[in-house]
Each structure stands twice: as structure tokens, then as C-alpha cells.
């Protein structure tokens, strides 16, 4: 998260860290007791490593009573996701067991109504991704409030040049932005999960390259079918 600040500890009990060999790789969001939603591209970086999900965390390194690392029983990338595009960049991870819920671990309601979020709406994005152009990675969860950007502006030739489909949404990226390591994390508007940070190689913090988020409402049928 660029230009953000440390989040209030455990105030986002849905927040997950998707880890490979014990190292944070991507964000994720608990959407059901045994399921975490993330970005499909995150699996590419996992290679043959052991994928696990950390729930109930604020600090990645410090012991916390609510922290627990879960093994992954099943990883389900969206069937249409591809390595060379950010289309359908969603991944569902089934935990080895149901998460132990409490004040610091709780699923987040996700948007089922397939309607665009009003441009200008302030949405919260959080993660353990890099916090500066230097690439420094934080130990504690960071967050930032970003205004939603209308698709027409996001698709301008000077911006993303038509790459933003109806199944994606954009948020402003002027110094405040999601970045490397935040992929798969939640974009939350009005207490509801609206988007998942895509995991392309986009430059961060540049207002002409807005943040791209996969709209979960556009994938409600797929999510329901996997969770069923």
C-alpha cells in the first residue's frame, strides 16, 4: 500500500495473508468459514512451494493470540484466468478446516448485485504489500482510502487504453495506491467486498495508471458454485 497508514489492529478480521513457504505473497479475503478469495496470478508465483493462509494477523512476524496459519486443501483459480492477462483474476482457496471465528477472524459480506460502484465512492484497500517505491515491505497491515474512478476515464488511451472490462473496476492511484504484494486483497466499499486487487505488473502510485480491481459481483455465480 503506497501513501497509506498502519491499519487499526484486527479491525479488518476478514483480511488474509496468502503465504508461500512462510513468506507473504498476496493478500486475500475470508468470504466464508472455509474459503479465502484472492487473485489467480498469485498461484503462478507459488510454483511448487507450500501455500498457506494466515488469518487473524496484524503483524506478520510478531506472535498474536488470534493468528493462525491454515493449510490449503484446494486451490481453485477461475477457469478463464490466464497468465498473460488480468481478466478473471480470481482464486478461491479452501482451507484445510473451517476457520476459528472470533473478533479478529470473520468473513466479509461480498457484493452480489452486479452494478458499478458510484465513481467517487471512497473504498478501503488493505494489505501487506510494499509501502514505498524502494520496495520496503511492512510487517503490520496497512490500508488506504481510494476514490472509485469511472471506467471511461480508466480506459482512456493515456490510462489503461481500453483494457478495463465491465468485470473490473478502477480506483485512483495518485500517490495513494495498492501495489506489489497487495494483489488478491480486498477493496471494501461501505463494509461490503466490491473488488479484489488484480496482480498485474502495473506501475504503482502513478495517477495515469489507476488501480485495477476485479469486481466480485460479476463473478457471483462462479463463487457460489465453488463454495456450494
Amino acid at each position: 500500500i503506497l501513501g497509506g497508514r498502519e491499519a487499526e489492529a484486527h479491525a479488518r478480521p476478514y483480511m488474509a495473508s496468502v503465504q508461500v513457504n512462510g513468506e507473504h505473497l498476496c493478500g486475500g479475503v475470508l468470504v466464508a468459514e472455509q474459503w479465502v478469495l484472492s487473485a489467480a496470478h498469485c498461484l503462478e508465483d507459488a510454483a511448487d512451494g507450500k501455500v498457506q493462509v494466515l488469518l487473524g494477523a496484524h503483524s506478520l512476524s510478531q506472535p498474536e493470540p488470534s493468528k493462525r496459519l491454515y493449510d490449503v486443501l484446494r486451490a481453485v483459480p477461475h477457469p478463464d484466468s490466464r497468465p498473460d492477462t488480468i481478466d478473471h483474476d480470481l482464486l478461491l482457496l479452501q482451507l484445510s478446516e473451517k476457520a476459528t471465528l472470533g473478533p479478529a477472524v470473520r468473513p466479509l459480506p461480498w457484493q452480489r448485485v452486479d452494478r458499478d460502484v458510484e465513481p467517487g465512492t471512497l473504498c478501503d484497500v488493505a494489505g501487506w504489500g510494499i509501502v514505498s517505491h524502494a520496495g520496503r515491505r511492512p510487517d503490520r497491515l496497512q490500508h488506504v482510502l481510494l476514490p472509485v474512478l469511472d471506467r471511461a476515464t480508466c480506459n482512456r488511451r493515456t490510462h489503461h487504453d481500453g483494457a478495463i472490462t465491465q468485470r473490473m473496476m478502477c480506483a485512483e492511484s495518485n500517490r495513494r495506491d495498492s501495489c506489489k504484494g497487495d494483489s488478491g486483497g480486498p477493496l471494501v466499499c461501505g463494509g461490503v467486498l466490491e473488488g479484489v486487487v488484480t496482480s498485474g505488473s502495473r506501475v504503482c502510485g502513478n495517477r495515469k495508471k489507476p488501480g485495477i480491481y476485479t469486481r466480485v459481483a460479476s463473478y457471483a455465480a462462479w463463487i457460489d458454485s465453488v463454495l456450494a
Epitope: 508461500v20 513457504n21 513468506e23 507473504h24 505473497l25 508465483d45 510494499i130 509501502v131 514505498s132 517505491h133 524502494a134 520496495g135 520496503r136 515491505r137 500517490r175 506489489k180 504484494g181 505488473s201 506501475v203
Partner: antibody, heavy 113, light 106 residues
């Protein structure tokens, strides 16, 4: 423990090229940025450029564009700095740095005929 | 390009003395980093994001500032603090270093 191990000192002739390596341990280079910084004898630090090893994206100080090429091999957790058309002005110590936080020990490059 | 000017270029301080050095930018910057380089060693990150202490750095070091003016303070000078200190900005590309302040022990 995070460590960056750089290749040994180089003595090269003017006009030649050299490739310096930086092998990381204790972390996966794909998860951060690797920077290269130079320091000429008795001078200050100069940022050369950086690479995002996950996708190969690079960014350079315009002053070093064409002179320096940064690459990475994620399979060996190693970053490289190639310097071309060397002159005496390129005589310096070159450091690789993880996120500007963890520094390698530096590689001394001397350009002399 | 953001030019960072550090002052003084050279200074000396006695053990226990408070030390302050400055870094001035020719245009407004943010995300200032400070590094320490002892003779014959690689630089070491001291301060990131203007005022945050890097891991393992003694609490006698502190950073502050905004806009075009930043400073690094050592509350009580110790012999091991004799080194050259560099500032670096991370808000305007290309990301530039200052010329350094050499701190000697009296």
C-alpha cells in the same frame, strides 16, 4: 537472515563490459525490488536503477540509461548489473540493495588499461 | 530532477553532544530515507519515510521534516556514530541521494 552476496572485484579494460551478480538468501527476490547503487572513490552514493524480479520491469536513472542493464534470475534468486562501454569514470564500488534496506558488501570495479 | 543538498558537508561533535544535520530539496519531496556509511563499510538504512527507525537502529537517531526541509538528529553522539550520512528522496523520479554529511568525533 536476509543477505546479499555480491561477486568479486573486477579489473577491466576501457571499452569492455562487465556483469556483476548479487545472490540473495533469506528471502525471495520476487517479493521485493532489487536496486543497484554506485559509489565512485571518495564520492557519494548514486542510484542506478531497480528491477522488479517478479516480472523483469526495470527503472533507471536517465544518467545510467544505456550504460547499465539490470536483470534477474528468480530460479537462482540472483540479480545482475551489466555495465557496458566502460571508461575510467565507471571505476566505482557497486552495491545491490534489497528495498534500500539490506545492502550487499559491494563489488569494486576498476577500469584501467 | 530533485536535487538534495546536505549541510554541513563536514561536522564534528563530542561524545554525548546532540547532533543535527539537514537535507534540503530544490522542490517538495516526501518519503525521505537516511543512511549511515562507516568507513570501509556498506551503507546502512537508519530512517525510512522521514521519521521511522529502521530495524536495529538505536533510538538516539531520529528524523523529521516535510516539503523541502528534512533533518536527522542524534540525541547523544557516540564514537560509533562517526560516519558519513546520506539522505535519499523517494517521491520524485529519479530517486536521488544528497551529497552526504561527514560526522567526525571530537
Amino acid at each position: 537472515e536476509v543477505q546479499l552476496q555480491q561477486s568479486g572485484a573486477e579489473l577491466v579494460k576501457p571499452g569492455a563490459s562487465v556483469r556483476l551478480s548479487c545472490t540473495a538468501s533469506g528471502f525471495n527476490i520476487k517479493h521485493t525490488y532489487i536496486h543497484w547503487v554506485s559509489q565512485r572513490p571518495e564520492q557519494g552514493l548514486e542510484w542506478i536503477g531497480k528491477i522488479d524480479p517478479a516480472n523483469g520491469n526495470t527503472k533507471y536513472d536517465p544518467k545510467f540509461q544505456g550504460k547499465a542493464t539490470i536483470t534477474a534470475d528468480t530460479s537462482s534468486n540472483t540479480a545482475y548489473l551489466q555495465l557496458s562501454s566502460l571508461t575510467s569514470e565507471d571505476t566505482a564500488v557497486y552495491y545491490c540493495v534489497n528495498a534500500m534496506e539490506y545492502w550487499g558488501q559491494g563489488t569494486s570495479v576498476t577500469v584501467s588499461s | 530532477q530533485s536535487v538534495l543538498t546536505q549541510s554541513p558537508a563536514i561536522m564534528s561533535a563530542s561524545p554525548g553532544e546532540k547532533v543535527t544535520m539537514t537535507c534540503s530539496a530544490n522542490s517538495s519531496v516526501s518519503d525521505m530515507y537516511w543512511f549511515q556509511q562507516r568507513p570501509g563499510s556498506s551503507p546502512r538504512l537508519l530512517i525510512y519515510d522521514t521519521s521511522n527507525l529502521a530495524s536495529g537502529v538505536p533510538v538516539r537517531f531520529s528524523g523529521s521534516g516535510s516539503g523541502t526541509s528534512y533533518s536527522l538528529t542524534i540525541s547523544r553522539m557516540e564514537a560509533e556514530d562517526a560516519a558519513t550520512y546520506y539522505c535519499q528522496q523517494w517521491s520524485t523520479y529519479p530517486w536521488t541521494f544528497g551529497g552526504g554529511t561527514k560526522l567526525e568525533i571530537k
